[in-house]
Amino acid sequence: IPTEIPTSALVKETLALLSTHRTLLIANETLRIPVPVHKNHQLCTEEIFQGIGTLESQTVQGGTVERLFKNLSLIKKYIDGQKKKCGEERRRVNQFLDYLQEFLGVMNTEWIIES
Amino acid sequence: IPTEIPTSALVKETLALLSTHRTLLIANETLRIPVPVHKNHQLCTEEIFQGIGTLESQTVQGGTVERLFKNLSLIKKYIDGQKKKCGEERRRVNQFLDYLQEFLGVMNTEWIIES
C-alpha cells in the first residue's frame, strides 16, 4: 500500500474491508478482547490497537485480510504521529489558554459525559 | 468543592472561571507551555494537564483561581477514570469489531485529518 494514500481515504477503505472480512474475523468463538465501555474513542486508541494486535495474531492471514491489518497499522502510525504533535510547539500562556478553552468547550458540547 | 457536582456542570463552571482569571494567568510574559498543533484534543489530554500543572505552579494562588485549578484537577480525575474504562471489559470479537467500526466511523466523519 503506498503510504501516500490520504488518511481519510485509508479510513474509508478500512471500514469497507472490515465489513468484508467480518465473518472470517469472528470465527474464533473463544477469543475475548478488551472493549472500551464509553464512546470517547480517542482516549482509548492504545487499547483499541492492542486489541487489533490480538485479533491479527489469531487470524489466518492471506488475501485482502492482510490489507485490512496493514491499513490498520498505517492508521495507528497516523495516530501516533498526531500524539507526537501534542507537545511539539511551546507557546505563550494566552495561546495555551485558548487551546484549553477550546478543549473544555468541545468536552462540554461533544463528549459523552457520564457523571 | 463537592465531588458530586456533575462533570458537565464542572466543565461549564471551569470555562467561566478560565475567562474570569485570564488576565491573572497570562501575567507571566516569558512562560512557554506546549500547545498541541491539532484539534483532536482527546489524544493530547496528558500534555494539556501537564501544561495546566506548569501554569498552576507559576500562578499566585488564592480566591477563585484556586477553585479553577481544583476544577481542572477534578476534570483530570474524570478523564483518568474514562481512560481506565478503556480496557476493563473483555468481550467477544464481534463486539470488539462493532466498537472498532464505530471508532473508524467517527474518525472518518468527525476527526480533523490532515494528510
Partner: antibody
Framework: QVQLQESGPGLVKPSQTLSLTCTVS??????????WSWIRQHPGKGLEWIGY???????YYNPSLKSRVTISVDTSKNQFSLKLSSVTAADTAVYYC?????????WGQGTLVTVSS | SYVLTQPPSVSVAPGQTARITCGGN??????VYWYQQKPGQAPVLVVH???DRPLGIPERFSGSNSGNTATLTISRVEVGDEADYSC???????????FGGGTKLTVLG
C-alpha cells in the same frame, strides 16, 4: 513551508467596507500553535497590528480599530478574512496577513488597498 | 495601552556597528522581537525572545533587553543590511500585539 496569500479589491470607496481574504497553504489553519493575524502599513510608516484570530474563533483586536474590525476564520477552506467598515483615506495601506506563534513566523506578500472615490 | 518608542533613523558606515533601540515601560520583563523589512517586501524576523536568532540570520545580528530599553545590534554592517527595523512585544494585560514605529537604517557611502 507555510505560505499565505492575500486577496481582495485594491480600491475601496470611502464609507464602504474593506474585505480581504488570506489563503493558507502548506499547513492547516486548525494548527493549535498559531494565531492568524492581519497587519497593515501606511505608506512610508511603521507596522500597525490590526488583530488576530484562533482557529476556535477567539478574536483579539487593536483597540484603536476594534469598533470597525471583524476577523473571521473558515477552517474548511483554510482561510481567514478581514473586514474593516466605514473606511476613509486614512485606511489606505499595504495589508499583510501573517501566522503568529510566539512571533510572526510567516507573512503574505502584502496587498495595497487604496481608499478613494 | 503599551507604547514602544524607536528612533526614526540610524546611520552607520559599512563595517561599523549599528545599534537600534526600542523603549518601553519595564520592557525588560517582556520578550522582544525584531523584524527587518526591505522596500516592497514583507518583514522578516531577525531576533526573537530578546536575543535569539532564527535559522539563516547571520551572527552579526544580536539583541539585548533590560530595564526600559531593548537593543538590536548589527555588527560589521553591510550595505545589504539597509532596511527598516521594527521591534514588537506582546501586551499581556490585553493579549494585544504592539509594534514600535520602526527605524530606518541607512548604510553610508
Amino acid at each position: 513551508q507555510v505560505q499565505l496569500q492575500e486577496s481582495g479589491p485594491g480600491l475601496v470607496k470611502p464609507s464602504q467596507t474593506l474585505s480581504l481574504t488570506c489563503t493558507v497553504s502548506g499547513g492547516s489553519i486548525s494548527n493549535g500553535g498559531y494565531y492568524w493575524s492581519w497587519i497593515r502599513q501606511h505608506p512610508g510608516k511603521g507596522l500597525e497590528w490590526i488583530g488576530y484570530i484562533y482557529y476556535s474563533g477567539s478574536t483579539y483586536y487593536n483597540p484603536s480599530l476594534k469598533s470597525r474590525v471583524t476577523i473571521s476564520v473558515d477552517t474548511s477552506k483554510n482561510q481567514f478574512s478581514l473586514k474593516l467598515s466605514s473606511v476613509t483615506a486614512a485606511d489606505t495601506a499595504v495589508y499583510y496577513c501573517a501566522s503568529l506563534g510566539n512571533w510572526f513566523d510567516y507573512w503574505g506578500q502584502g496587498t495595497l488597498v487604496t481608499v478613494s472615490s | 495601552s503599551y507604547v514602544l518608542t524607536q528612533p526614526p533613523s540610524v546611520s552607520v558606515a559599512p563595517g561599523q556597528t549599528a545599534r537600534i533601540t526600542c523603549g518601553g515601560n519595564n520592557i525588560g520583563s517582556k520578550n522582544v522581537y525584531w523584524y527587518q523589512q526591505k522596500p516592497g517586501q514583507a518583514p522578516v524576523l531577525v531576533v526573537h525572545d530578546d536575543s535569539d536568532r532564527p535559522l539563516g540570520i547571520p551572527e552579526r545580528f544580536s539583541g539585548s533587553n533590560s530595564g526600559n530599553t531593548a537593543t538590536l545590534t548589527i555588527s560589521r554592517v553591510e550595505v545589504g543590511d539597509e532596511a527598516d527595523y521594527s521591534c514588537q512585544v506582546w501586551d499581556s494585560s490585553s493579549d494585544h500585539v504592539v509594534f514600535g514605529g520602526g527605524t530606518k537604517l541607512t548604510v553610508l557611502g
